[in-house]
């Protein structure tokens, strides 16, 4: 996502509206403490990072907070005083929304409801992948509110599930990121399990009257 | 249906005010930014900035700084735009726009689906 | 600044006919382009955004293709109300505008 300007790669990651992360990757300044200037109006001075992300000892990143802010973030990464990358990104189109809350989990027969805490912020899919030993893939449904049913499950099979949100690319486009996903949870016959059986264990025999 | 509703032309002397509003109708006024744009007799469009109608928050684009504020009254949805200490350059259409997709909780981010239908600023002595 | 570049700076065509207006940015955009057409006396009004997604409303003539730095608007089958001038618009910043088309016909 960062064009190259002397060799500069530059990756921006917004955590849901209230972080911001800026790297670099600048294979001819590696061994240099490259530095990163910025500011969240076109006409103020710039600030300096203060909290830089290192690797290998050197300066790779930033993190801003910039909670709830609804602006262009301009930024100059340097080394010393002469500027090796200059830009100004809307921080909206690098988003990513964090992992859903407090999942819950209704089951109802051949049926369960998927429920989490929505986000203060809209425009969002709340997306729930499911699975039980016998599938090859993950199954998929998504909704713009975290409370989405999936029918026709069965109910004597052990169904894996997790959640996570993604912001809807006609509004915030291609380049946002998917929340990291929540924790896979285990359920059979509407009950938590542990895990689900690797292997699919054989459907017991009908017993007939 | 969403409406933007400018007010009327102006003729100003060198060195006066003005103040252009843009009441707004069809959605709820405090959901999304609305940008100050001009247009130059013969030419192209200028983005002047954008308030965030849930903040009130002013953001000014480079060359926009000083002279010009905004402002809102959100009790009417009505953004305005304020000019001091005119200049014959400032003879130029303004247009109001709402952001088309990105709330204010989250920002505005520059596409224009909603307009104004343009106020026309005169400066002449 | 990103800088906006379209051409040709106005063309004439004759209804029916295939016509192609071109942007180029001054630095890697993505898609985050918009086309606008405007008419004498009106307000712009959005065709295209994310480079090629139609808004609402806008006839399947219109069509947008491009990413990065080249981005290209065409109408398929030029018709006698598409008479206008048209912008391309960048929004990855703050947004700035190519300097217009204005498309008439022969």
């Known amino acids: 996502q960062g064009g190259a300007a002397e060799g500069v790669q530059i990756q921006i990651i917004y955590f849901n509206l209230e972080t911001v992360q800026v790297t670099w990757n600048a294979s001819k300044y590696s061994r240099t403490n490259l530095t990163f200037h910025y500011r969240f109006n076109g006409d103020e001075a710039y600030d300096q990072c203060t909290n830089y992300l290192l690797q290998e000892g050197h300066t790779s990143g930033c993190l801003l907070d910039a909670e709830q802010r609804d602006d262009i973030l301009y930024f100059s990464i340097r080394n010393g005083t002469h500027p090796v990358f200059t830009a100004s990104r809307w921080m909206v189109y690098y988003l990513k929304p964090s992992s859903p809350k407090h999942v819950r989990f209704s089951w109802h027969q051949d049926a369960v409801t998927v429920t989490c805490s929505d986000l203060s912020y809209g425009d969002l899919l709340y997306e729930v992948q499911y699975r039980s030993p016998f599938d090859t893939e993950w199954q998929s449904k998504q909704e713009n509110t975290c409370n989405v049913t999936i029918e026709g499950l069965d109910a004597e099979k052990c169904y894996s599930f997790w959640v996570r949100v993604k912001a809807m690319e006609d509004v915030y486009g291609p380049d946002t990121y998917p929340s990291d996903w929540s924790e896979v949870t285990c359920w059979q016959r509407g009950e938590i399990r542990d895990a689900c059986a690797e292997t699919p264990t054989p459907p017991k025999p009908k017993l007939s009257k | 249906q969403v409406q933007l509703v400018q007010s009327g032309a102006e003729v100003k002397k060198p060195g006066a005010s003005v103040k252009v509003s843009c009441k707004a109708s069809?959605?709820?006024?405090?959901?999304?930014?609305i940008s100050w744009l001009r247009q130059a007799p013969g030419q192209g469009l200028e983005w002047m900035g954008w308030v965030n109608t849930n903040t009130g928050n002013p953001r000014y684009a480079q060359g926009f700084t000083g002279r010009f504020v905004f402002s809102l009254d959100t009790s009417v949805s009505t953004a305005y735009l304020q000019i001091s200490s005119l200049k014959a350059e400032d003879t130029a259409v303004y247009y109001c726009?709402?952001?088309?997709?990105?709330?204010?909780?989250?920002?505005?981010?520059?596409?224009?689906?909603?307009w104004g239908q343009g106020t026309l600023v005169t400066v002449s002595s | 600044d990103i800088q906006m570049t379209q051409s040709p700076s106005s063309l004439s065509a004759s209804v029916g006919d295939r016509v192609t207006i071109t942007c180029r940015a001054s630095q890697d955009i993505h898609t985050r382009l918009a086309w606008y057409q405007q008419k004498p006396g009106q307000p712009p009004k959005l065709l295209i955004y994310?480079?090629?997604t139609r808004a609402s409303g806008v006839p399947d003539r219109f069509s947008g293709t491009g990413s990065g730095t080249d981005f290209t608007l065409t109408i398929s089958s030029l018709q006698a109300e598409d008479v206008a001038v048209y912008y391309c618009?960048?929004?990855?910043?703050?947004?700035?505008f190519g300097q217009g088309t204005k498309l008439e016909i022969k």
């Open positions: 994310w480079a090629s």
């Open positions: 618009q960048q929004y990855s910043t703050y947004p700035t």
């Open positions: 069809g959605y709820t006024f405090t959901t999304y930014g």
């Open positions: 726009a709402r952001e088309g997709f990105i709330t204010t909780v989250v920002g505005a981010a520059g596409r224009f689906v909603y």
